[in-house]
């Protein structure tokens, strides 16, 4: 059933999430900037077809529209999406020495955000079953594919975070 913004989510949790989203957005932007500056891969829209052929998935947030937000479903989709991006970022490992530290920080920040969401779901008694394993992740056959994949994963993640931020900000409104 839909739950409005006056739901049972503590303000401290929502503010922590908003903080974490902005931290990850900063990490993601730094990765995008380095991919652009180092490899001239600056326009994710030019790589969409390659993204289809590589099988880079999107994470849905269909349970999170502000007009008919389903709290349990939305938090679950947020967590599942973050779990998906952990796997996608893992698949990018070894992208290049220059990008390694930025990618490492992004990976950990995404994992920490997933922890925050799960922790809150657990406290509300709505924690989902633990995902046993990651689904099939894209296999990058070349350095170019991995870098192009990096551009697309960072772009997808940023879109996911923008929606997440809007949802969380909506929930945080008194």
């Amino acid at each position: 059933t839909p739950l409005g913004p006056a739901s049972s989510l503590p303000q401290s949790f929502l503010l922590k999430c908003l903080e974490q989203v902005r931290k990850i957005q900063g990490d993601g932007a730094a990765l995008q900037e380095k991919l652009c500056a180092t490899y001239k891969l600056c326009h994710p829209e030019e790589l969409v077809l390659l993204g289809h052929s590589l099988g880079i998935p999107w994470a849905p947030l269909s349970s999170c529209p502000s007009q008919a937000l389903q709290l349990a479903g939305c938090l679950s989709q947020l967590h599942s999406g973050l779990f998906l991006y952990q796997g996608l970022l893992q698949a990018l490992e070894g992208i290049s020495p220059e990008l390694g530290p930025t990618l490492d920080t992004l990976q950990l920040d995404v994992a920490d955000f997933a922890t925050t969401i799960w922790q809150q779901m657990e406290e509300l008694g709505m924690a989902p079953a633990l995902q046993p394993t990651q689904g099939a992740m894209p296999a990058f056959a070349s350095a170019f594919q991995r870098r192009a994949g990096g551009v697309l994963v960072a772009s997808h993640l940023q879109s996911f975070l923008e929606v997440s931020y809007r949802v969380l900000r909506h929930l945080a409104q008194p």
């Epitope: 990976q107 994992a111 955000f113 997933a114 799960w118 922790q119």
Partner: antibody, heavy 119, light 112 residues
Framework: QVHLQQSGAELARPGASVKMSCKAS????????MHWIKQRPGQGLEWIGY????????NYNQKFRDKATLTADKSSSTAYMQLSSLTSEDSAVYYC????????????WGQGTLVTVSA | DIVMTQAAFSNPVTLGTSASISCRSS???????????LYWYLQKPGQSPQLLIY???NLASGVPDRFSSSGSGTDFTLRISRVEAEDVGVYYC?????????FGGGTKLEIK
């Protein structure tokens, strides 16, 4: 309540390997990252790396990439660190600490495992 | 890597008076989200470290309000308003803005 129980002290020869454990209780183990930190006698703290048990992903401080191997067993809620090709420089106390964000980061530590490397 | 710098020893303090411990980072720890990713830990003799302060100025659960922390993006100060015997130990600052996480060398609180 959260508790991290580390394995006992290890005495090893130069060139040998050791594997220590950190058993977690009081929380859902796979959800949190587990970090490992080194402290040489009378010295400061050095971050070695972390394991994300939910996806089995480990990340290392470059300095320890060829020294440490981090693993986790979800069924027993235990994180492991193996140290290889031991030298006297590896003689230290090694701590596990639970990861997280904000007030959760390193809010819980194991009691430490002392590794002594001696011929 | 971000380098965290601390003096090895504090100025000796008398019990009941205030003490300050400083820390400097080689890069600003202030993120664009407004959070400063600076932490303080205390390691008492023979014990594991414990979290005191997170995100530069927030007191961790169970930490007495005698402890406070402030700073800019690169220079930080931990203050203990009324030092007690149980405060003795080594104080470490640490950053978690980016990997690898790094710690300062630690400052030993000296009692007169």
């Amino acid at each position: 309540q959260v508790h991290l129980q580390q394995s006992g002290a290890e005495l090893a020869r130069p060139g040998a390997s050791v594997k220590m454990s950190c058993k977690a209780s009081g929380y859902t183990f796979p959800i949190y990252t587990m970090h490992w930190i080194k402290q040489r006698p009378g010295q400061g703290l050095e971050w070695i790396g972390y394991i994300n048990p939910s996806i089995g992903y480990a990340n290392y401080n470059q300095k320890f990439r060829d020294k440490a191997t981090l693993t986790a067993d979800k069924s027993s809620s235990t994180a492991y660190m193996q140290l290889s090709s031991l030298t006297s420089e590896d003689s230290a106390v090694y701590y596990c600490a639970r990861g997280g964000y904000g007030d959760s980061l390193f809010a819980y530590w194991g009691q430490g495992t002392l590794v002594t490397v001696s011929a | 890597d971000i380098v965290m710098t601390q003096a090895a020893f504090s100025n000796p303090v008398t019990l009941g008076t205030s003490a300050s411990i400083s820390c400097r980072s080689s890069k600003s720890l202030l993120h664009s989200n407004g959070i400063t990713y600076l932490y303080w830990y205390l390691q008492k003799p023979g014990q594991s470290p414990q979290l005191l302060i997170y995100q530069m100025s927030n007191l961790a659960s169970g930490v007495p309000d005698r402890f406070s922390s402030s700073g800019s993006g690169t220079d930080f100060t931990l203050r203990i308003s009324r030092v007690e015997a149980e405060d003795v130990g080594v104080y470490y600052c640490a950053q978690n803005l980016e990997l690898p996480y790094t710690f300062g060398g630690g400052t030993k609180l000296e009692i007169k």
